[in-house]
Interface confidence: low
């Protein structure tokens, strides 16, 4: 915390301007009125304050707004945003996309992922849902930021907005996030023809259930191996050799390359070796001929 002192009369501040860069930290603390600072926040970013001086200004705003800054201040934070912690941002109520854009621009090139994720979360809460304008802003100014949102927040995305999401926006999404987004994408693209549908749904398939993957195998989609490898393990395991062959089409040869990787490895272990041999790829590790497969989980459930 900054030491409290009395402001010397000659240092009294009547407006926020460049003269303040010469003030020592304790002079800024003593001489800058927090209400004046808040009213003239739009000037702060044009003044080359040191990070230590920005700490003082932040401290003053924190004292003035202990429950969180108003959006009129947030909008003009500029590089002062770099001083904000996720805990600070969690107190904010942000509804303006102009505010979001301004702060996303400031954060570029700085390690601010935690702060940006919290900011986006506050915008979604403030706006009531993850609407198309918000998604468009995120994809334009913060590619990949969509994945910083929790599954709960992503559940507020209307299916109509899904079309604005690009494949690269989903690169860092986890399984639980794709589980939320996939059904929305399926709904959003349901009226498209087979090949067009597959191109659109492909980035979301990490959230697809077995029955949908099986359905795709009947549509000659020729799924690439990279997409296949991102499918849920649970979605892949029940597929038959014939279904995987149909699903991958000419890309089926890639299974040999991925033979030791999940989900391919786990899938191989579930197939009869006879069936795997029909692919002619030399895949090994299937259930040997003549072996009986007992589903012990049924017995365990009964005992």
């Amino acid at each position: 915390d900054v030491e409290r002192t009395t402001c010397p009369p000659e240092k009294e501040v009547h407006e926020i301007d460049e003269s303040l860069i010469f003030y020592k930290k304790r002079e800024l603390e003593a001489c800058v009125d927090a209400a004046l600072l808040a009213a003239q926040m739009d000037r702060v970013d044009a003044i080359p304050f040191t990070y230590e001086q920005l700490d003082v200004l932040k401290h003053k705003l924190d004292e003035l707004y202990p429950q969180g800054y108003p959006e009129s201040v947030i909008r003009h934070l500029g590089h002062l945003f770099l001083k904000m912690s996720p805990e600070d941002i969690r107190k904010w109520n942000v509804t303006s996309l102009e505010t979001l854009k301004a702060l996303l621009k400031v954060s570029k090139g700085h390690e601010m992922s935690a702060q940006v994720a919290t900011l986006i979360d506050r915008v979604v809460v403030g706006r009531g849902q993850l609407d198309k304008d918000t998604v468009d802003t995120l994809t334009a100014f913060c590619p990949g930021c969509l994945c910083s949102l929790s599954p709960e927040r992503l559940s507020s995305v209307p299916p109509s907005v899904i079309g604005a999401v690009r494949p690269q926006d989903l690169d860092t999404c986890g399984p639980r996030q794709l589980d939320v987004l996939y059904p929305k994408a399926r709904l959003a693209f349901q009226n498209m023809s087979g090949s067009e549908y597959f191109v659109k749904i492909r980035p979301f398939l990490g959230g697809a259930p077995t029955e949908d993957v099986k359905a795709l195998s009947q549509q000659n989609v020729s799924m690439d191996l990279a997409t296949f490898m991102k499918l849920r393990r649970e979605a892949v395991l029940p597929l038959t050799v014939a279904e995987v062959q149909k699903l991958l089409g000419p890309h089926v040869e890639g299974l040999k390359v991925e033979e030791q990787h999940s989900p391919v490895r786990d899938w191989i272990l579930k197939q009869r070796q006879d069936d795997l041999d029909t692919l002619g790829l030399g895949l090994q590790g299937g259930i040997p001929n003549g072996y009986l497969i007992l589903d012990l989980s049924v017995r365990e459930a009964l005992s």
Epitope: S113, C142, P143, G144, C145, C147, Q168, D171, T172, C173, G174, P175, G206, A226, M229, K230, R232, Q260, H261, S262, R265, D266
Partner: nanobody, 117 residues
Framework: EVQLVESGGGLVQAGGSLRLSCAAS????????MGWYRQAPGKQRELVAA???????NYADSVKGRFTISRDNAKNTVYLQMNSLKPEDTAVYYC???????????WGQGTQVTVSS
């Protein structure tokens, strides 16, 4: 198949820093999202940080603001800068491709990070 070799671990005091590196072989490295994972004794392996092919990053709550993931596609390397380390960060750290959906059985040896109090 991409081969991954992690390095840079070691013993460090709480509050200290380490920089982990993960060197990858394979010409398609730059097109893969990459992830750093860790596994503490008796615990499940967890995703710590992810970086997309374009450089977008994502972090677990427990490391946000302390860890930074980055990549150098020219060197086929992904890094994890770990600052303000805590004893609870002690684990074996691994990197892998196709994050956060990761092959179960194609992990490297990992690199041990031990943070003493």
């Amino acid at each position: 198949e991409v081969q991954l070799v992690e390095s840079g671990g070691g013993l460090v005091q709480a509050g200290g820093s380490l920089r982990l590196s993960c060197a990858a072989s394979g010409s398609t490295f730059s097109s893969y999202p990459m992830g750093w994972y860790r596994q503490a004794p008796g615990k499940q392996r967890e995703l710590v940080a992810a970086i997309s092919s374009g450089g977008s990053t994502n972090y677990a709550d427990s490391v946000k603001g302390r860890f930074t993931i980055s990549r150098d596609n020219a060197k086929n390397t992904v890094y994890l800068q770990m600052n303000s380390l805590k004893p609870e960060d002690t684990a074996v750290y691994y990197c892998n491709t196709r994050s956060p959906r990761v092959p179960n059985d194609s992990w490297g040896q990992g690199t041990q990070v031990t943070v003493s109090s």
